[in-house]
């Protein structure tokens, strides 16, 4: 079944833009002028998930790229990375649930919990041009929180 | 506050053209989803389509072909451009505010636009 | 493509009644349900979404339930202001959204 999908970029609370940081890693960092044409495109997509009562799932792929943010158990700990797909197959309403995030959206913030890993966060360091990762904790020191932009093409 | 305003409303023979405009204030469009929804007098609302960024715009299946959304988020503006107009196209238009990306529910809508198709 | 069916279409009933107006969906839709309210010349207002949850400024007479393909819409105390069109939404069907008819509520 066809999917609603999106062309967007996401910068954290604090400004920072989401950037590519080798094939298989997004960092993020403060961009300016025309460095901010080195932000990811990110195709959101609505896909099926649990029922709850306002968290809406998504999964992040890379515009144009057959990449997808997926979570997964490495060495015992909830990892994010960018994983291969074949393009012919996504996106789709039925995502396998390392590709799902329950995008939580309060006072045009976001959030974007793994569902995968329930209350683990897409998250950014306060430190620039570190990796963007999956975080287990909300309201600490790692920025969880996201503003996102439509992207005209 | 936040206010949705449609304009571009009016009698319009069959066959012909118009485009319905929705202007926002209190909140910017660069990441907010619309849709325009319409009614027929006396009956129920039928939605027509939504646009997210400029290049993802989805509609019902009767819209497609004829009916056209865009945006130009400099003048935090919607569009709703429609051809081939039928006696049956006959309505109120509103735009609306998704009320969260992909939520699917509208949670600000616009007074309406009437269009009336006829000769 | 999903088709929204509310029933009944036509209900009449006095202040202070409860009043409960369902909607069926051709297949299930999880809880991806909306309710309207909209009055004669008006826009609709956002009365419930994800089948339960009340929408801001909705007063607690409002409720909503149901999951999958049975959903419903209670007024548990029917107030003057009340007597409008209401209708039902699927929100998360694919790339389109379909409304049920509508239910009028009148006065008996």
């Known amino acids: 079944a066809p999917v609603r999908s999106l062309n967007c970029t996401l910068r954290d609370s604090q400004q920072k833009s989401l950037v590519m940081s080798g094939p298989y890693e997004l960092k993020a960092l403060h961009l300016q002028g025309q460095d901010m044409e080195q932000q990811v495109v990110f195709s959101m997509s609505f896909v099926q998930g649990e029922e709850s009562n306002d968290k809406i799932p998504v999964a992040l792929g890379l515009k144009e790229k057959n990449l997808y943010l997926s979570c997964v158990l490495k060495d015992d700990k909830p990892t994010l990375q960018l994983e291969s797909v074949d393009p012919k197959n996504y996106p789709k309403k039925k995502m396998e649930k390392r590709f799902v995030f329950n995008k939580i959206e309060i006072n045009n913030k976001l959030e974007f919990e793994s569902a995968q890993f329930p209350n683990w966060y897409i998250s950014t360091s306060q430190a620039e041009n570190m990796p963007v990762f999956l975080g287990g904790t909300k309201g600490g020191q790692d920025i969880t929180d996201f503003t996102m932009q439509f992207v005209s093409s | 506050e936040v206010q949705l305003v449609e304009s571009g409303g009016g009698l319009v023979q069959p066959g012909g053209s118009l485009r319905l405009s929705c202007t926002a204030s209190?909140?910017?469009?660069?990441?907010?989803?619309m849709a325009w929804v319409r009614q027929a007098p006396g009956k129920g609302l039928e939605w027509v389509g939504i646009?997210?960024?400029?290049?993802?715009?989805y509609y019902a299946s009767w819209a497609k072909g004829r009916f056209t959304i865009s945006r130009d988020t400099s003048k935090n503006t919607v569009y709703l451009q429609m051809n081939s107009l039928r006696a049956e196209d006959t309505a109120v238009y509103y735009c609306?505010?998704?009320?969260?990306?992909?939520?699917?529910?509208?949670?600000?809508w616009g007074q309406g636009t009437l269009v009336t198709v006829s000769s | 493509e999903i088709v929204m069916t509310q029933s009944p279409s036509t209900l009449s009933a006095s202040v202070g009644d409860r009043v409960i107006i369902t909607c069926q969906a051709s297949?299930?839709?999880?809880?991806?349900l909306s309710w309207y309210q909209q009055k004669p010349g008006k826009a609709p207002k956002l009365l419930i979404y994800?089948?339960?949850t009340l929408a801001s400024g909705v007063p607690s007479r409002f409720s909503g339930s149901g999951s999958g393909a049975e959903f419903t819409l209670t007024i548990s105390s029917l107030q003057p202001d009340d007597f409008a069109t209401y209708y039902c939404?699927?929100?998360?069907?694919?790339?389109?959204?379909?409304f049920g008819q509508g239910t009028k509520l009148t006065v008996l």
């Open positions: 646009i997210y960024d400029s290049a993802s715009t």
């Open positions: 609306a505010r998704e009320r969260q990306i992909f939520s699917g529910d509208m949670a600000g």
């Open positions: 939404q699927n929100t998360g069907g694919g790339v389109s959204i379909a």
């Open positions: 994800r089948a339960s």
């Open positions: 297949q299930s839709i999880d809880n991806w």
């Open positions: 209190g909140f910017s469009l660069s990441s907010a989803a």
